[in-house]
């Protein structure tokens, strides 16, 4: 004797997040009379998705006209799919009963898998700046993707990095997944303009990976090199002492002139020049009136860079001798000057 069968022809359906899923179901008979219901999951905890007979299911539409008397197509469409909709859906035929309808036969189920794009990778560097030759860690995070398979690569200025560790969570089955990766990068003095890139490839991205970037300019601190030199000026009783501050980054820098250990003047780097590698140069001038001094003068250029402990360079100014050139300005890039007289 013939008996109604519930056919769900698709074992699995793969849908991109935000799209509409079509779950197909047909019955092979109009007998027995009774409604169809759709559930996600099986057993006592199953979730009602659609009831042909009653209820309000705003995300669900029927493919065929449900009021058509000879309708055997119980396919439904679920709109605006999210990863949370993933699961196995069952089309279940009920036999009309009193007081309640009785479950008669279920389809074999259709597994709905949701393809969700990963979020844009967010790359974050260390909290504090580090100096060249130090190794710093960068993290990259991306969330909300499905299925679990994903590829993550690190690059520094287009060169692929190999020193990194990646985890995809959770380890077991989930509606969506997250990836977390930590890469180690050795800084060099030339890294002010460098970029670290985290690249994520996933089936939903159709060969066009997502990238997150971090500029090493936010991570690196290149300490300055100091050079103090003395040049004569036309007036025989005056000497020009310059402090060349070279190759520093970031720009935040404060310079103090000390005369025999006593603060003479403090100034902040303003009109700096930028080098091709992104570092800065600055020069401060000090015009010394030699005739005002009986003894030799020790001039110190003290620089505090980016809140770090001060570094200094000293120059001994001989007042007994006739002023003559004791050094030369070798930094062609230096154009800025600060002129002061000491009397």
């Amino acid at each position: 004797e013939e008996e109604l069968q519930v056919i769900q022809p698709d074992k699995s359906v793969l849908v991109a997040a935000g799209e509409t899923a079509t779950l197909r179901c047909t019955a092979t008979s109009l007998i027995p009379v009774g409604p169809i219901q759709w559930f996600r999951g099986a057993g006592p905890g199953r979730e009602l998705i659609y009831n042909q007979k009653e209820g309000h299911f705003p995300r669900v539409t029927t493919v065929s006209e449900p009021t058509k008397r000879n309708n055997m197509d119980f396919s439904i469409r679920i709109g605006n799919i999210t990863p949370a909709d993933a699961g196995t859906y069952y089309c279940v035929k009920f036999r009309k009963g009193s007081p309640d309808d009785v479950e008669f036969k279920s389809g074999a189920g259709t597994e709905l898998s949701v393809r969700a794009k990963p979020s844009a990778p967010v790359v974050s560097g260390p909290a504090a700046r580090a100096t060249p030759q130090h190794t710093v860690s960068f993290t990259c995070e991306s969330h909300g993707f499905s299925p679990r398979d994903i590829t993550l690569k690190w690059f520094k200025n287009g060169n692929e990095l190999s020193d990194f560790q990646t985890n995809v969570d959770p380890v077991g089955e989930s509606v969506s997944y997250s990836i977390h990766s930590t890469a180690k990068v050795v800084l060099t003095r030339e890294d002010v303009h460098s970029q670290v890139i985290c690249e994520v490839a996933h089936v939903t991205l159709q060969g066009d990976p997502l990238r997150g970037t971090a500029n090493l300019s936010e991570t690196i601190r290149v300490p300055p090199t100091l050079e103090v030199t003395q040049q004569p000026v036309r007036a025989e009783n005056q000497v020009n002492v310059t402090c060349q501050v070279r190759k520093f980054y970031p720009q935040r820098l404060q310079l103090t002139w000390l005369e025999n250990g006593n603060v003479s003047r403090t100034e902040t780097a303003s009109t700096v020049t930028e080098n091709k590698d992104g570092t800065y140069n600055w020069m401060s001038w000090l015009l010394v009136n030699v005739s005002a001094h009986r003894d030799d003068v020790k001039l110190t250029c003290q620089v505090e860079h980016d809140g770090q402990p001060a570094v200094s360079k000293s120059h001994d100014l001989k007042v007994s001798a006739h002023p003559k050139e004791q050094g030369s300005n070798t930094a062609a890039e230096n154009t800025g000057s600060n002129e002061r007289n000491i009397y």
Partner: antibody
Framework: QVQLQESGPGLVKPSQTLSLTCTVS??????????WSWIRQHPGKGLEWIGY???????YYNPSLKSRVTISVDTSKNQFSLKLSSVTAADTAVYYC???????????WGQGTTVTVSS | DIQMTQSPSSLSASVGDRVTITCQAS??????LNWYQQKPGKAPKLLIY???NLATGVPSRFSGSGSGTDFTFTISSLQPEDIATYYC?????????FGGGTKVEIK
């Protein structure tokens, strides 16, 4: 007023595939919820239902022909098609396409096309 | 498959006669039954759906009845244009199946 028109070769060689198309005019193939069926009638015999396709793209084929039948729909051309593979002389028949509308029953039929399987 | 047994396979009646055709299903099909008329060289035409409902444009001399396994199709007053073969078809179970047909002729 919906009308159906079958088209395809009248002669097919044994072991080849019979291909027929039903063109729907006077209405959209995708509107409403009709079942689009193929039926055949052997010379001097009764009617045999081959199978149908409907809105969701779901097909159901008569088990007696299932392994050889494919019914498909092309909504852009407002057509549905029948393919029957590995034909023999026993597949010689008049082939009809039909629509089952909102009410039960195939209320619109094509005029039928005769297909002869012969070498 | 549901077997549909139609009888008689042919009959001859006079114009104005009442003609009755029966159709028996191999199991209960409720009232999921249709009746078709097919004239020579033509496609079938739906006359009755859901066992007893007259299709659009069909003369009222045609009627149908029955439920479960036994069904009857009646032409209350046979007309010359009714010469045709009549088929029952069940749609309660897939695959849909037809009866063998009843050929109606005029005496």
């Amino acid at each position: 007023q919906v009308q159906l028109q079958e088209s395809g070769p009248g002669l097919v060689k044994p072991s080849q595939t019979l291909s027929l198309t039903c063109t729907v005019s006077g209405g959209s193939i995708s509107s409403g919820s009709p079942y689009w069926s193929w039926i055949r009638q052997h010379p001097g015999k009764g009617l045999e239902w081959i199978g149908y396709i409907y809105a969701s793209g779901f097909t159901y084929y008569n088990p007696s022909l299932k392994s050889r039948v494919t019914i498909s729909v092309d909504t852009s051309k407002n057509q549905f098609s029948l393919k029957l593979s590995s034909v023999t002389a026993a597949d010689t028949a008049v082939y009809y396409c039909a629509r089952e509308g909102y009410h039960s029953g195939m209320d619109v039929w094509g005029q039928g096309t005769t297909v002869t399987v012969s070498s | 498959d549901i077997q549909m047994t139609q009888s008689p396979s042919s009959l001859s009646a006079s114009v104005g006669d009442r003609v009755t055709i029966t159709c028996q299903a191999s199991q209960d099909i409720s009232n999921y039954l249709n009746w078709y008329q097919q004239k020579p060289g033509k496609a079938p035409k739906l006359l009755i759906y859901d066992a007893s409902n007259l299709a659009t444009g069909v003369p009222s001399r045609f009627s149908g009845s029955g439920s479960g396994t036994d069904f009857t199709f009646t032409i209350s007053s046979l007309q010359p244009e009714d010469i045709a073969t009549y088929y029952c078809q069940q749609f309660a179970y897939l695959p849909w199946t037809f009866g063998g047909g009843t050929k109606v002729e005029i005496k």
